[in-house]
Interface confidence: low
């Protein structure tokens, strides 16, 4: 597997108006490394194994370059025309990748709303978009604003394709091991949610990386979202990280549902326990 | 500029209820987890409550879980804190408070609530 | 949930003086801790986070250090306007519990 180093960059729009913040996270080998707010820009480790990959650096040109690059997502932005009434959002992710052979790729995507409407490989320079119209109209309007600059944005990508493995390269120089890999423990409980209802809740702790998904299935199919609860995946104090998914279904029927959870390639499904095991707290608020 | 601006505390007997509002401004409220913290007349700070951004999550201090309920509006930029089943040991002055993950550094101007019969 | 123990609870000092306030963790938080100031009836002001970064406007008399459970609020010459509370809060994991307070006075 290579390794990676991802930026994802949002900015946001209300009513057609660009707001002054932005969010950039940055993904060192799949794992949170860097985190940028929209309110002020602090470039900082995302836990203890980041500072243990830099020392005691100081963020200053991170900070510098990530508040650099969220300026130009939003003057993007504001050059996409089918902006409507409410919330909006502009997203651009760039990957880069050094792989075993010592080949590099880089990659540059662009989501509106949270739909992928273009994207560039830094290296060839070519670009692909979907078919949607939505999607080719969005694409459009975005390459028309960064071609208004040729020359500015044919060196802005270099540059990003540049940096972005340079930087890579320097965390990767610093030696720590970055692929722990601690699988989660998983526990399914039920409690009594009304008459005829259970509550069941699927929790998975002592894992790690955080990036983890945790669902429950009926008949093995996905349950839809506004009928399952999610925690927060949070620090356990241990180094690893634990969270939980809950729903409510009818009693007797749980044979139906399994808790499916994949973390780091891994997969698996776990049952409802039979009978009633005591849940002395239910996370349904 | 930014700011919360509480409201709604009042003088309640125990038992009875109140609802608090927080009010933001000169921000993407949209954006951040809001929270709730309280403090009794000359004690420390007591974290209450926090809902997510989107309103999705919501966690509880032991204190006060299953009697508060927190919520938002994001439309309005205003944060709400319903306070049921009130007890003496409530009367304090409500924050409410945000910013980063990893720091409150909005707050409130706080509002008062006390609790007596 | 995770207790934060400070100490001490209250001092007397001078203008001038070095200070240092120490928060303990009941179990380990990385560097998810804050310090607020507290001056009373006002709400409190965040002076440093991530255990050891100065927030923005805070002067640089002010600084923090340590991981894990044990962590420490110096302020390096005490000046007039810095007599007030003092408290840490943990952001690990929830409840984000508060330190209970290192009141700071006068000698």
């Known amino acids: 597997e290579p390794h990676s180093l991802r930026y994802n960059l949002t900015v946001l729009s209300w009513d057609g108006s660009v707001q002054s913040g932005f969010l950039t996270e940055v993904h060192l080998d799949g794992q949170p490394f860097l985190r940028c707010d929209r309110q002020k820009c602090r470039a900082k480790p995302q836990g203890q194994w980041a500072e243990d990959v830099l020392g005691n650096k100081t963020w200053d040109r991170e900070t510098r370059d990530l508040t650099g690059n969220g300026k130009d997502l939003r003057m993007t932005l504001a050059h996409i025309k089918d902006q409507k009434e409410g919330l909006h959002s502009l997203q651009e992710i760039r990957v880069c990748e050094i792989h075993e052979d010592n080949s590099t790729r880089s990659s540059q995507h662009f989501y509106y709303d949270g739909e992928l409407f273009l994207s560039q490989n830094l290296e060839t320079k070519e670009w692909t978009m979907p078919q949607s119209s939505r999607a080719q109209t969005l694409a459009m309007n975005v390459r028309n604003f960064l071609k208004e600059d040729a020359m500015k944005t044919k060196t802005h990508y270099h540059a990003m394709h540049a940096d972005c493995l340079q930087e890579l390269r320097r965390y990767l120089k610093s030696g720590v091991v970055l692929r722990r890999t601690v699988p989660p423990m998983v526990n399914v409980t039920r409690s009594e949610a009304s008459e005829g209802n259970i509550t069941v809740t699927c929790r998975a702790s002592g894992f790690y990386p955080w990036n983890i998904t945790l669902s429950w299935r009926q008949d093995g199919v996905s349950l839809s979202h506004d009928t399952q609860q999610w925690g927060d995946v949070l620090p356990d104090g241990n180094g690893t990280y634990q969270t939980w998914v809950a729903t409510r279904i009818c009693q007797g029927e749980e044979q139906r549902f399994t808790c499916y959870m994949e973390h780091s390639g891994n997969h698996s499904t776990h049952p409802v326990p039979s009978g009633k095991v005591l849940v002395l707290q239910s996370h349904w608020q | 500029q930014v700011q919360l601006v509480e409201s709604g505390g009042d003088v309640v007997q125990p038992g009875r209820s109140l609802r608090l509002s927080c009010a933001a401004s000169?921000?993407?409220?949209?954006?951040?987890?809001i929270h709730w913290v309280r403090q009794a007349p000359g004690k420390g700070l007591e974290w209450v409550a926090v809902i997510r951004y989107d309103g999705i999550n919501k966690y509880y201090a032991d204190s006060v879980k299953g009697r508060f309920i927190i919520s938002r509006d994001n439309s309005k930029n205003t944060l709400y804190l319903q306070m049921n089943s009130l007890r003496a040991e409530d009367t304090a002055v409500y924050y409410c408070?945000?910013?980063?993950?990893?720091?409150?550094?909005?707050w409130g101007q706080g509002t008062m609530v006390t609790v007596s019969s | 949930a995770i207790q934060l123990t400070q100490s001490p609870s209250s001092l007397s000092a001078s203008v001038g003086d070095r200070v240092t306030i120490t928060c303990r963790a009941s179990q380990g938080i990385s560097s998810a801790l804050a310090w607020y100031q507290q001056k009373p009836g006002k709400a409190p002001k965040l002076l440093i986070y991530?255990?050891?970064s100065l927030e923005s406007g805070v002067p640089s008399r002010f600084s923090g250090s340590g991981s894990g459970t044990d962590f420490t609020l110096t302020i390096s010459s005490l000046q007039p306007e810095d007599f007030a509370t003092y408290y840490c809060?943990?952001?690990?994991?929830?409840?984000?519990?508060f330190g209970p307070g290192t009141k700071v006075d006068i000698k």
């Open positions: 408070a945000s910013g980063p993950p990893d720091a409150f550094n909005i």
């Open positions: 991530d255990a050891s």
């Open positions: 809060q943990q952001f690990n994991s929830y409840p984000f519990t």
């Open positions: 000169g921000f993407t409220f949209s954006n951040y987890n």
